[in-house]
Amino acid sequence: LPRWRQQWSGSGTTSRFPETVLARCVKYTEVHPEMRHVDCQSVWDAFKGAFISKYPCNITEEDYQPLVKLGTQTVPCNKTLLWSRIKDLAHQFTQVQRDMFTLEDMLLGYLADDLTWCGEFNTFEINYQSCPDWRKDCSNNPVSVFWKTVSRRFAETACGVVHVMLNGSRSKIFDKNSTFGSVEVHNLQPEKVQALEAWVIHGGREDSRDLCQDPTIKELESIISKRNIRFFCKNIYRPDKFLQCVKNPEDSSCLSGI
């Protein structure tokens, strides 16, 4: 008889999760020479140890501490790119601008990007049927706690001028409840971060409004300024042209505004 298993509202662990994490780790360490010392089996053991046999609504940041230590990486000053609700463009940008890094360009972010995982209390099994949903079940679930933990650490270690890409098509361009708004903003270290520069990405081709004047951007400016970090904002009216100009900065059309 199959064991009774708790039904959660969210989708279950991504199929072949252990194999995927291990394969991603091996690939990452092959491509990034500075991470060649990383033992991917230990990384998987630490990842697994954070959620296996644990009640999936009672996960803590401490559970991920071994993984965070094993996956330690530093980003050079001025090279951190945060993003909120505009992941694809942020990743397209760092794929072209190879010296800038989002969290998903770092080992731990790369391992977990787009994956779901959870276990069950007192068994060594991975739950492939369902996992807790952040809204409907609980916030202290393995996936949410992981991203909160690594996002906090990513922001804590940033230095110089930090950039953030924001989605200008959303009703709340800056959302206090996003990972950026609730975790990263509050963990930038004023003694190391001189400024936060927001890039507001416009959606419509004919949209010429100055979205840097949006009330939510002003709210972000206020939060950042109160933390003794300078704030700058730029409109990116043409994201397609923006990416093209990152690829080919000498292009004559790139001398005009983007």
Epitope: S42, G49, Q65, P66, K69, L70
Partner: antibody, heavy 118, light 107 residues
């Protein structure tokens, strides 16, 4: 090969401060945590805390907060630990350990003996 | 903080004996336990990491086992150079903590 070279023994007066250094060689200093460990004469090992030189991020054992302060100079590949308001309880050998970002301590410095005495 | 209870605190054995040192963690530390050897007047040296992995250059007579909260270090065929104090250490969570040590003497 990986080496951690610590500064020499120190004799200091109660209430004073001391700064111990740990110079790393044989690896990329900024990328790896440096751990600090205390050993009092005839007693066991105590973890004080650690620092990631590349970012300056630190973790301290609650017991040593206010007592130990970690810094690092990436230009000279040197980590420092300052101990303040010294008492006889602080008389000990202090070790730095590091390399690998592991959850264990692979390479150790030779230790720095700090003696607090009037 | 996670407490590491190591036993025995001292141990006397004969050359060629097999000895076992145990370490008990106050909470689950998965496999994040390492063992160190410290000879008199020397620095600690890593013997075993991740509960059972032998560090480079360490003789195969040393072995480690366990996971969760219970761990053991075994030295088979005791040699004179094994006279030392042995410590366990957990790396599961900050602050990292060590066992109190086991002083090994030869009869």
């Amino acid at each position: 090969q990986v080496q951690l070279q610590q500064s020499g023994a120190e004799l200091v007066k109660p209430g004073a401060s001391v700064k111990i250094s740990c110079k790393a060689s044989g690896y990329t200093f900024s990328n790896y945590w440096i751990e600090w460990v205390k050993q009092r004469p005839g007693l066991g090992l105590e973890w004080i805390g650690d620092i990631l030189p590349g970012s300056g991020t630190t973790n301290y054992n609650e017991k040593f907060k206010g007592k130990a302060t970690f810094t690092a100079d990436t230009s000279s590949n040197t980590a420092y630990m300052q101990l303040s308001s010294l008492t006889s309880e602080d008389s000990a050998v202090y070790y730095c350990a590091g390399y690998g970002n592991y959850l264990w301590f692979t390479y150790w410095g030779q230790g720095t003996l700090v003696t607090v005495s009037a | 903080d996670i407490q590491m209870n190591q036993s025995p605190s001292s141990l006397s054995a004969s050359l060629g004996d097999t000895i076992t040192i145990t370490c008990h963690a106050s909470q689950n530390i998965n496999v994040w336990l390492s063992w160190y050897q410290q000879k008199p007047g020397n620095i600690p040296k890593l013997l075993i990491y991740k509960a059972s992995n032998l560090h480079t250059g360490v003789p195969s007579r040393f072995s480690g086992s366990g996971s969760g909260t219970g761990f053991t270090l075994t030295i088979s065929s005791l040699q004179p150079e094994d006279i030392a104090t042995y410590y366990c250490q957990q790396g599961q969570s900050y602050p990292y903590t060590f066992g109190g040590g086991t002083k090994l003497e030869i009869k």
